[in-house]
Structures are given as structure tokens and as C-alpha cells.
């Protein structure tokens, strides 16, 4: 999958764009909005109705390196009087996010834009019944 | 810094910490080969806590095209069907990681960003303060 | 066609404990749960508890919570039962079933049955 | 927890007949599955949902009821039949069974 040139005609390459060379891109690290914080929406992980764990996942060549996935809890979800309700599913939501990867080849090094997938909660789904005719 | 093992051989000039600009391939390697993304596709209208999806489009981002979740309701669907106001719907938000042209309008120089998405939502009890 | 292959029998001492396997193939393994019930000597199918490999949900009949633990190798496409403290009563025929893949069907929906695995527990 | 009681226990009955199997549960379920278990054998997948026939089922089988008393038909017994029946749902945790009704071919 490769990244898409800027496709608008409004848009002219600036003179101030840095040479690249082909097949590849200059890509800068220093996150924009890295001091950005979530306001932790007061662990909702432990009050939804198909609550979920958090685990961080560690690889070094990886930027950035730490990966927080959420794995839900249960299968079903969990009703008014605190049991699990299993005529409903806990379902994890997932989102895509970019990371660099670090590729040691021989005594080169070289980077990769990986996509992954990140499952951030879970949510309670009522699943398809499909009734016969 | 982190450690990374590295051939004996090799000159030990490297820092052992990403740096700061690098050059990436154009093309981007994709972990998700198994998952299956229609499964998932409709979890919005199923959901206890459903919600829509708006585009958010910039095409200084890559990638361009970004969903963002907006719960339906304030409360939570209960098993007739209504809306039950003793629970919440609550949106569930994940930094992302994205690249943003720069200088802007360049095709082949970008820097990484941290944005902030509602991805889906979820149904809560609330937190009752009792009065002492 | 779906498969699920389980160990083979065990003999153990009391206060032991004991894993079973089962490999999953004919199927996308993360996309289905997978549960795990017990049948005692003539006696009725008891549900232990299931599994979901892809979000790690777990579910567990209250009567096996400290006495199994189900657990995953998505890599393997295999999942685990292990019992533990292993007592006489424990003494039985184990199956790994599949369940339902919460999109198309609910996850407690049980289609395809392992051969099942027998674990004695004897002094 | 749903307790499931099958009735009877037991049956002996003749090829060609027809085989009623009930399954009365201590609270409303929405569904039920029925399995069979032939000798040395794991248990197999009969109907889902009530009424709905696995794939591979032959059509003598059939299923119904509704609220607490459910009901597998077998329309034209076989001998291949004999086998334990169970009774299943997954409406209300834990998922459970019924205690089996063990059909013996004459």
C-alpha cells in the first residue's frame, strides 16, 4: 500500500520540499502533539457493560515501542445485576495506527510504515440470528 | 536508551535509540492479515451503546480519510429496544498515530502525529456520588 | 472441514495438575470461540467455560472458576484447559467444542465437538 | 442457574416409530439445541435454535417449543437413531444441559 501523492491541483510542490530519494520518504519522529493526554474517561474499562484489560505489548524496534491493547473481559456482558448476560457478546473495537518499524540487515538498518491493528475496548452487540423461512 | 542486539561485527556507531528523521519505504506493511474486517463492520448499529460514523477528511494527513464514532444516545438500549437513561453511553477514544505532510504539500516528507479518535462507544453504569 | 483434535488420556495423582489441548483446523481459529465441557462417568454434559482467542474474553461456569483455566495459541491455532488440584471427582471425559464467532452466531452457540480426552485421577 | 429436565430417561422403542423427546426448563428460555451422543462417541449438533436443522441432519428430526417446553421429534426411527439425546441452552449463565434421554433400539 503505498502513500498517495498529494492529488489536489491547488496543490504545487513547494521549492522547500527536501530531495527524497525514489521509492522512498523522509519521515520526521518527533511527534506533533505529543504532550497531548487523554483524559482517562474514569476507567470505564472496569464500568461498561462489556468490560476489558489492558496489556501493554514492548518491542524496541518498534516506534514507539509500547502498545496498550484491550482484551475484553468476558464472552457475554454483563447485566443489571452484575452476571454475565449470555445472550449478548462482548465485541472488541479495533482501529488502525501507523508505527516505524527498525529492520536490522546485516550491519544496515532500515525503516518500515507498518499498519496495526489496536483493539482499544469492548462493546456489547446483540449477534445476527438469522431465522430460517 | 534501549538495547538492541546487534552483530558483533558491525561498527558500533549507531544510536541505540530511533532517530529523530529517518528514511522509510514508500510502502507501508500491513499487520492485519487476519482479521476480518467485515465482521466488525456493523457493530455500530448492533451495539447496546450504537453510534454513527462521521468521514474527517484531510489530505495533508495520510491517512487521509479518518472515521470518527458519535454515540446515539445518552443512555443505553436496553432488551425491548428503548433507550434505558440509567445507563451511559460513553465514547471510547484512542490515540492514533498519523502522518502529517510537512513541510505541508510535499509528497515525500512527513512527520508522525498524535491524534486523538473516538473509535466506537460503550455502555457504562455511572458513577453515583452518594451525598454524606 | 472444521477439526478439533485433542490430547491424549492422562492418569494423575491427586493434587495434580493436568493441561489438554485441542487443534483447531479447517477454520480461521480466531474468529470462533472455543468451550470446553466436562461428562463425568453417565452423567449429564457440564459446561465449564469458554474462550474468545481473538478479543481474550473468557467466560467460566462458576462450579470450574479456580479449578480450570482456559487459555490460547492463536499461533497454533490450538486452545488449553488446565485443571488443577486434580481430585477423584475430577475423574471424567473432556471436550473442547467450538462456539459461535459473535457476528453470525452468539458465542455460546456449540457446533463442532474434539473426540475428547479422558483424565483419570487415581492414587 | 436454568435446569433442564428431559423425559423420560429412557425409551425402547421399534424402527419406523416416532420418537417424542420433551425438555422443560425451570425458567423462559428464548432457545434451545438438541445433541446426539451415539456410544464412545463426542456429541453432535441435531438442531439449533429450536427448530433449525444442522447441516448433515437427516429431516426424520425435528424441533419446537417455545417459553419453558420444548420438544425433538424423530418422525421415522432408524436404527442408527440409538443414541443419548441432550437438551441445551444458552439464554441465562452458566450454559447447561439436560440430564439425557437414552433411546435403545428394539
Known amino acids: 500500500r503505498k502513500i498517495p501523492k498529494v492529488g489536489h491541483t491547488f496543490f504545487q510542490k513547494p521549492e522547500s520540499c527536501p530531495p527524497v530519494p525514489g521509492g522512498s520518504m523522509k519521515l520526521d519522529i518527533g511527534i506533533i502533539n505529543e504532550n497531548q493526554r487523554v483524559s482517562m474517561s474514569r476507567n470505564i474499562e472496569s464500568r461498561s457493560t462489556s468490560p476489558w484489560n489492558y496489556t501493554v505489548t514492548w518491542d524496541p524496534n518498534r516506534y514507539p515501542s509500547e502498545v496498550v491493547q484491550a482484551q475484553c473481559r468476558n464472552l457475554g456482558c454483563i447485566n443489571a445485576q452484575g452476571k454475565e448476560d449470555i445472550s449478548m457478546n462482548s465485541v472488541p473495537i479495533q482501529q488502525e495506527t501507523l508505527v516505524v518499524r527498525r529492520k536490522h540487515q546485516g550491519c544496515s538498518v532500515s525503516f518500515q510504515l507498518e499498519k496495526v491493528l489496536v483493539t482499544v475496548g469492548c462493546t456489547c452487540v446483540t449477534p445476527v440470528i438469522h431465522h430460517v423461512q | 536508551g534501549i538495547t538492541i542486539p546487534r552483530n558483533p561485527g558491525c561498527p558500533n556507531s549507531e544510536d541505540k535509540n530511533f532517530p529523530r528523521t529517518v528514511m522509510v519505504n514508500l510502502n507501508i506493511h500491513n499487520r492485519n492479515t487476519n482479521t476480518n474486517p467485515k465482521r466488525s463492520s456493523d457493530y455500530y448499529n448492533r451495539s447496546t451503546s450504537p453510534w454513527n460514523l462521521h468521514r474527517n477528511e484531510d489530505p495533508e494527513r495520510y491517512p487521509s480519510v479518518i472515521w470518527e464514532a458519535k454515540c446515539r444516545h445518552l443512555g443505553c438500549i436496553n432488551a425491548d429496544g428503548n433507550v434505558d437513561y440509567h445507563m451511559n453511553s460513553v465514547p471510547i477514544q484512542q490515540e492514533i498515530l498519523v502522518l502529517r505532510r510537512e513541510p505541508p504539500h510535499c509528497p515525500n516528507s512527513f512527520r508522525l502525529e498524535k491524534i486523538l479518535v473516538s473509535v466506537g462507544c460503550t455502555c457504562v453504569t455511572p458513577i453515583v456520588h452518594h451525598v454524606a | 472441514q472444521v477439526q478439533l483434535v485433542q490430547s491424549g488420556a492422562e492418569v494423575k495423582k491427586p493434587g495434580a495438575s493436568v493441561k489438554v489441548s485441542c487443534k483447531a483446523s479447517?477454520?480461521?481459529?480466531?474468529?470462533?470461540?472455543m468451550h470446553w465441557v466436562k461428562q463425568s462417568h453417565g452423567q449429564r454434559l457440564e459446561w465449564m467455560g469458554g474462550i474468545n482467542p481473538n478479543s481474550g474474553g473468557v467466560s467460566y461456569n462458576q462450579n470450574f472458576k479456580g479449578k480450570a483455566t482456559l487459555t490460547v495459541d492463536t499461533s497454533a491455532s490450538t486452545a488449553y484447559m488446565e485443571l488443577s488440584s486434580l481430585r477423584s471427582e475430577d475423574t471424567a471425559v473432556y471436550y473442547c467444542?467450538?462456539?459461535?464467532?459473535?457476528?453470525?452466531?452468539?458465542?455460546?452457540?456449540?457446533?463442532?465437538w474434539g473426540q475428547g480426552t479422558t483424565v483419570t485421577v487415581s492414587s | 442457574e436454568i435446569v433442564l429436565t428431559q423425559s423420560p430417561d429412557f425409551q425402547s422403542v421399534t424402527p419406523k416409530e416416532k420418537v417424542t423427546i420433551t425438555c422443560s426448563a425451570s425458567s423462559s428460555v428464548n432457545y434451545m439445541h438438541w445433541y446426539q451422543q451415539k456410544p464412545d462417541q463426542s456429541p453432535k449438533l441435531l438442531i439449533k435454535?429450536?427448530?433449525k436443522l444442522a447441516s448433515g441432519v437427516p429431516s426424520r428430526f425435528s424441533g419446537s417449543g417455545s417459553g419453558t417446553d420444548f420438544t425433538l421429534t424423530i418422525n421415522s426411527l432408524e436404527a442408527e437413531d440409538a443414541a443419548t439425546y441432550y437438551c441445551?441452552?444458552?439464554?441465562?449463565?452458566?450454559?447447561?444441559f439436560g440430564q439425557g434421554t437414552k433411546l435403545e433400539i428394539k
Open positions: 467444542a467450538r462456539g459461535g464467532d459473535g457476528y453470525y452466531t452468539n458465542y455460546f452457540d456449540i457446533d463442532y
Open positions: 479447517g477454520y480461521t481459529f480466531n474468529e470462533y470461540t
Open positions: 441445551q441452552q444458552w439464554n441465562s449463565h452458566p450454559l447447561t
Open positions: 435454535d429450536t427448530s
